[in-house]
Interface confidence: low
């Protein structure tokens, strides 16, 4: 038996369902009683889901997995993973045994879009050209870790004194805080771009300083 999976990683958004595709070519006269199908985590060999002895043995993985029982006889051994979490990310092995056996691994890449950045300015009043200010750009609940870029009003990169920290919460999603310390010009726009490298999603925030008042 030959097992086939998609070579490209499956990208799934957090809290959505993902299908890990796996198929095999059953021979004529194939019966489900002959099938031993095992899904497991590639690295740890932890059992995820199985079908043996002609029946679905169910989920061994957080009760969030399911097969497509009506399609098994046609050779569709795909696995449905419900309500995807960051901790689901990784490689899953589809193992099929009939008379002989084969296996193949499929990667699950989990992603979550970052929120529109919120911008704060410190100090935020009585500002004059030449003052040193701290601009903080905060974006929340994304995955994987973001790439953060600062740009000026002309779209040119600001590579000065930038400190970026990313902290995972209990769901594994990242909160990004990027701090730019800059000397004010007469006026100017400071933009922060938070990019999700998997989704190729850009979230933008900016602050414009034109004497008084500031606009966000």
């Amino acid at each position: 038996v030959e097992v086939q999976v998609s070579e490209d990683p499956v990208v799934a958004l957090v809290d959505t369902d993902a299908t890990l595709r796996c198929s095999f070519s059953p021979e004529p006269g194939f019966s489900l009683r002959q099938l031993n199908l095992i899904w497991q985590l590639t690295d740890t060999k932890q059992l995820v889901h199985s079908f043996t002895e002609g029946r679905d043995q169910g989920s061994a993985y957080a009760n969030r997995t399911a097969l497509f029982p009506d399609l098994l006889v046609q050779g569709n051994a795909s696995l449905r993973l419900q309500r995807v979490r960051v901790t689901d990310e990784g490689s899953y092995t589809c193992f099929v045994s009939i008379q002989d056996f084969d296996s193949a691994a499929v990667s699950l890449q989990v992603a979550a879009p970052y929120s529109k950045p919120s911008m704060t300015l410190e100090p935020n009043k009585d500002l004059r050209p030449g003052d040193m200010v701290t601009i903080t750009c905060s974006s929340y609940q994304g995955y994987p870790e973001a790439e953060v870029f600062w740009k000026d009003g002309q779209g040119l990169p600001l590579t000065g004194n930038v400190t970026t920290s990313q902290m995972a919460n209990e769901r594994g999603l990242f909160d990004v805080h990027s701090v730019l310390r800059v000397v004010l010009g007469a006026n100017g726009t400071y933009s922060c771009l938070v990019r999700n490298p998997v989704l190729q999603q850009d979230a933008h925030g900016s602050v414009t300083i034109t004497g008084q008042p500031m606009t966000f």
């Epitope: 740890t44 932890q46 960051v86 901790t87 902290m167 995972a168 209990e170 594994g172």
Partner: antibody, heavy 121, light 107 residues
Framework: QVQLVESGAEVKKPGSSVKVSCKAS????????ISWVRQAPGQGLEWMGR????????NYAQKFQGRVTITADKSTSTAYMELSSLRSEDTAVYYC??????????????WGQGTLITVSS | DIQMTQSPSTLSASVGDRVTITCRAS??????LAWYQQKPGKAPKLLIY???SLQSGVPSRFSGSGSGTEFTLTISSLQPDDFATYYC?????????FGQGTRLEIK
């Protein structure tokens, strides 16, 4: 029921390093976070940092940044905490802890038995 | 870092008493607060999480309340087994921080 078993007590010289292990059983180790918390004699609890094994992400308290390294080996369900440049104030009981199955990663319903590290010349 | 301040540092009470321990955060932590009990030579034991949720297996005489910056742990009727040191812990932001502890002793 998660069980956390730590390595044994050690006596170390100032300036040296120590590596404490914490072996987990009874749960899906890689899905959880393992934190390290220390307690100096007669003192309170102090969080040092944590790792999420499945993500390979560690976070440290600023106080220990650069001196502590937390790692995890998924294959053996073991977390490690290495503290370098030891000084006498590092004499403490070091605990590993985690949140188990259903609670937050940051509240600790399972604790190791504690490892006493004594730093003395 | 968020500072957690417990009061009192030491509390003398008798079996059957109702006792309250207070924990103050230096800034708002919403309800992300836990309470632990620790006995000498033992690891801490989780009593309360998310300010007021009772951990499984913990007697109902323990209760927690509060949000923002002010929190309390109440033991409705002290039992001999309750004499120990109690710690609050915030998990609103890194680094996780604990209060300095409240030692509950027999009067």
């Amino acid at each position: 029921q998660v069980q956390l078993v730590e390595s044994g007590a050690e006596v170390k010289k100032p300036g040296s390093s120590v590596k404490v292990s914490c072996k987990a059983s009874g749960g899906t180790f890689s899905s959880y976070a393992i934190s390290w918390v220390r307690q100096a004699p007669g003192q309170g609890l102090e969080w040092m940092g944590r790792i999420i094994p499945i993500l390979g992400i560690a976070n440290y308290a600023q106080k220990f940044q650069g001196r502590v390294t937390i790692t995890a080996d998924k294959s053996t369900s073991t977390a490690y905490m290495e503290l370098s440049s030891l000084r006498s104030e590092d004499t403490a009981v070091y605990y590993c802890a985690n949140g188990g199955d259903s609670s937050s990663w940051y509240t600790f319903d399972y604790w190791g038995q504690g490892t006493l590290i004594t730093v003395s010349s | 870092d968020i500072q957690m301040t417990q009061s009192p540092s030491t509390l003398s009470a008798s079996v059957g008493d109702r006792v309250t321990i207070t924990c103050r955060a230096s800034e708002t932590i919403s309800s992300w607060l836990a309470w632990y009990q620790q006995k000498p030579g033992k690891a801490p034991k989780l009593l309360i999480y998310k300010a007021s949720s009772l951990q499984s297996g913990v007697p109902s005489r323990f209760s927690g309340s509060g949000s923002g910056t002010e929190f309390t742990l109440t033991i409705s009727s002290l039992q001999p087994d309750d004499f120990a040191t109690y710690y609050c812990q915030q998990y609103y932001s890194y680094p996780i921080t604990f209060g300095q502890g409240t030692r509950l002793e027999i009067k």
